[in-house]
């Protein structure tokens, strides 16, 4: 019954682009400007979500699918499709009601975005520190002291502290 | 005995989507991230994005953000990817891995996991 | 993001020999520089981390060095069982990345 009332349909020879209109028997139209179908068989068309404020556009609206947001310079996304955009803040911080704050002493943040997350523990794993950490950095898990040779120091320092480039998320 | 074990291999027709999963054990699943690299046939390897099981922290590869999606379990200890809108490119090999101890390099590969596209 | 060039797609050499393999990014990594082995079946194996610290189980004849943009891997003593792919990969920047690889093959 479902197979025969969808060759019947009329509407269901609409293409993905165009809205069966029933102001004019049932005839495939082009969705209006700045509306889109992603789908065949559709009675209206939908929107186009507009990037506006801290929202940039990522890719136009076409009649066949909707616009993508992304955020503009020293903000990134949150959420399904970019829903929300939030602050950025430095490496080696994170981002609180107060603004961006400085990773506390054993916890870092090596991007522009997200929360201070402890230092690797190298113990939990039978190992030891190689590197230490920094506001900006996880430590770098090494040997276990048991396999370094007698005197070898089982720790160096961090690098310099440098803001690498960082991929927006 | 620490590993990671991936699902079997999946043939997909172009648009649809398959879900991969790497179930880890043999270590504290919530404390190391698990990454995702991609080996297209005769290629070289390419960082998908990662998770974080503890509270499902991610990040992606930009250039993957649209069409992987990355989720972990952790009752069962188990790591996913899911592939959407699937395209011939999308052929290939697919490895999760674990880190060595913090999330600059990957100690632990899983065997990998062949996903075919083809109409 | 950071592209990691290994100028050698692949390389013949015999057993006993020497190998050396470089990797240059294309910017300072600060020595967060690994390299990774896959032998012909897909099999993948962490050699060395950190530029130059070899992984526990892996044999003392590899070798790794450098530092900045520039950084090399070093079989000091072929054996059979090397004859795989070698790659690359920087952990310092998010979207981590690998090199081409180099294919190690037995005169």
């Known amino acids: 019954f479902e197979r025969t009332r969808s060759l019947q349909d009329p509407c269901s020879n609409c293409p993905a682009g165009t809205f069966c209109d029933n102001n004019r028997n049932q005839i495939c139209s082009p969705c209006p400007p700045n509306s889109f179908s992603s789908a065949g068989g559709q009675r209206t068309c939908d929107i186009c979500r507009q990037c506006k404020g801290v929202f940039r556009t990522r890719k136009e609206c076409s009649s066949t699918s909707n616009a993508e947001c992304d955020c503009t310079p020293g903000f990134h996304c949150l959420g399904a499709g970019c829903s929300m955009c939030e602050q950025d803040c430095k490496q080696g911080q994170e981002l609180t009601k107060k603004g961006c704050k400085d990773c506390c002493f054993g916890t870092f943040n090596d991007q522009k975005r997200g929360i201070c997350r402890p230092w690797t523990n190298c113990s939990l794993d039978g190992k030891s520190v190689l590197v230490n950490g920094t506001k900006e950095r996880d430590v770098v898990c090494g040997p276990s002291p048991a396999d370094l040779s007698p005197g070898a120091s089982s720790v160096t320092p961090p690098a310099p502290a440098r803001e690498p480039g960082h991929s927006p998320q | 005995q620490v590993q990671l074990v991936q699902s079997g291999a999946e043939v997909k027709k172009p648009g649809a989507s398959v879900k991969v999963s790497c179930k880890a054990s043999?270590?504290?699943?919530?404390?190391?991230?698990i990454n995702w690299v991609k080996q297209a046939p005769g290629q070289g390897l390419e960082w998908i994005g990662n998770?974080?099981?503890?509270?499902?922290?991610?990040n992606y590869n930009q250039k993957f953000k649209d069409k992987a999606t990355i989720t972990a379990d952790k009752s069962t200890s188990t790591a996913y990817m899911e592939l959407s809108s699937l395209r011939s490119e999308d052929t290939a090999v697919y490895y999760c891995?674990?880190?060595?101890?913090?999330?600059?390099?990957?100690?632990?590969w899983g065997q990998g996991t062949t996903v075919t596209v083809s109409s | 993001d950071i592209q990691m060039t290994q100028t050698t797609s692949s390389l013949s050499a015999s057993l006993g020999d020497r190998v050396t393999i470089s990797c240059r990014p294309s910017q300072d990594i600060s020595n967060y520089l690994n390299w990774y082995q896959q032998k012909p079946d897909g099999t993948v194996k962490l050699l060395i981390y950190y530029t130059s610290r070899l992984r526990s189980g892996v044999p003392s004849r590899f070798s790794g060095s450098g530092s900045g943009t520039d950084y090399s891997l070093t079989i000091s003593n072929l054996e059979q069982e090397d004859i795989a792919t070698y790659f690359c990969?920087?952990?310092?920047?998010?979207?981590?990345?690998f090199g081409g690889g180099t294919k190690l093959e037995i005169k």
């Open positions: 990969q920087q952990g310092d920047t998010l979207p981590y990345t």
């Open positions: 891995t674990r880190d060595y101890g913090s999330a600059y390099s990957y100690s632990l």
């Open positions: 998770i974080y099981p503890s509270d499902s922290y991610t």
């Open positions: 043999g270590y504290t699943f919530t404390s190391y991230w």
